[in-house]
């Protein structure tokens, strides 16, 4: 009788282990599905917003000519701002002309008023030269007004209608830029 009870107990334990394994597999499968779902949704969102609507810019981005701009709603240091833009398939704003600068400052006035926004401009520590993130030099009229006396790395930001410089480790809003999608119609 005791042997019978012990055999049943072992069988039950074995069953329990199998059920736990199945539950673990199911949880893992569910997690995997959720992850796949997340990517599918992101992919669908991107596809729908760009292809279906033939919209040149994603939702919440502003268009001007061939560019789309995203004005952040969070603060971050310059390097984190750069990474946040990369996550969206964009780079920190690179201002090519006075016309673009005027558009940006005009848009900022409408959206948020007079705050600081990181752009993709930084000063080389050795040469002191200002360079955009792709390595190109800013046009003479688009050099930051000397304002930062920082011993640390210095980066460029936009405030009101000026381009200024500050320690890259300070917290500011930021602006991302990507190319607008051409309509295939």
């Amino acid at each position: 009788k005791l042997l019978q009870v012990s055999t049943i107990a072992m069988q039950q334990q074995e069953k329990l282990i199998q059920q736990e394994r199945a539950l673990l597999n199911f949880t893992e499968w569910k997690r995997s599905c959720a992850l796949q779902m997340k990517y599918c949704q992101a992919f669908m969102q991107n596809s729908l917003s760009s292809a279906h609507n033939s919209s040149p810019c994603p939702n919440n981005w502003i268009q001007n000519r061939e560019s789309c701009y995203y004005v952040s709603e969070i603060w971050s240091i310059w390097h984190t701002s750069q990474e946040n833009c990369l996550k969206e398939g964009s780079t920190l704003l690179q201002i090519e002309s006075k016309e673009e600068m005027d558009f940006i400052t005009g848009s900022l006035r409408k959206i948020k008023g007079s705050y600081d926004y990181w752009v993709g401009l930084s000063q080389d520590g050795h040469s002191g030269r200002w360079l955009w993130q792709d390595g190109s030099s800013p046009s003479p009229g688009l050099l930051p007004a000397e304002r930062s006396q920082s011993a640390n790395q210095v980066c460029g930001y936009v405030k009101s209608n000026s381009l200024l410089s500050s320690n890259c480790s300070t917290w500011k809003y930021f602006i991302c830029e990507k190319y607008a999608l051409r309509s295939s119609v």
């Epitope: 796949q36 997340k38 990517y39 992101a42 992919f43 750069q82 990474e83 990369l86 996550k87 969206e88 398939g89 964009s90 780079t91 920190l92 993709g120 993130q133 792709d134 390595g135 830029e177 990507k178 190319y179």
Partner: nanobody, 117 residues
Framework: QVQLQESGGGLVQPGGSLRLSCAAS????????MGWYRQAPGKQRELVAA?????????ADSVKGRFTISRDDAKNKNTVYLQMNSLKAEDTAVYAC?????????WGQGTQVTVSS
Amino acid sequence: QVQLQESGGGLVQPGGSLRLSCAASGSIVSINSMGWYRQAPGKQRELVAAITDQGRTTYADSVKGRFTISRDDAKNKNTVYLQMNSLKAEDTAVYACKAFGRFDDYWGQGTQVTVSS
């Protein structure tokens, strides 16, 4: 999930060149940008260069004019290269590839680059 496979690291003399490559596989539709980071012993990890799915590039100040990041369009934009010229001793580090997604980021194992005579 996204898997990243780096190659091309090694030992090179100062002034020499190396070309690193990073091949992505898996759920690559979720990737918006790819980049290279480096970390030297006792130093913070830094972003060296990155490229977006549209081909926009960004570089660290210390490598501008010497390093070039590019993408292999023939391979569905899932292979990224870092051409490193005029290498200096201070470029010695472990170089790791990173894939940027809106929701998640993925890292490669890293490859050692040593610049020494």
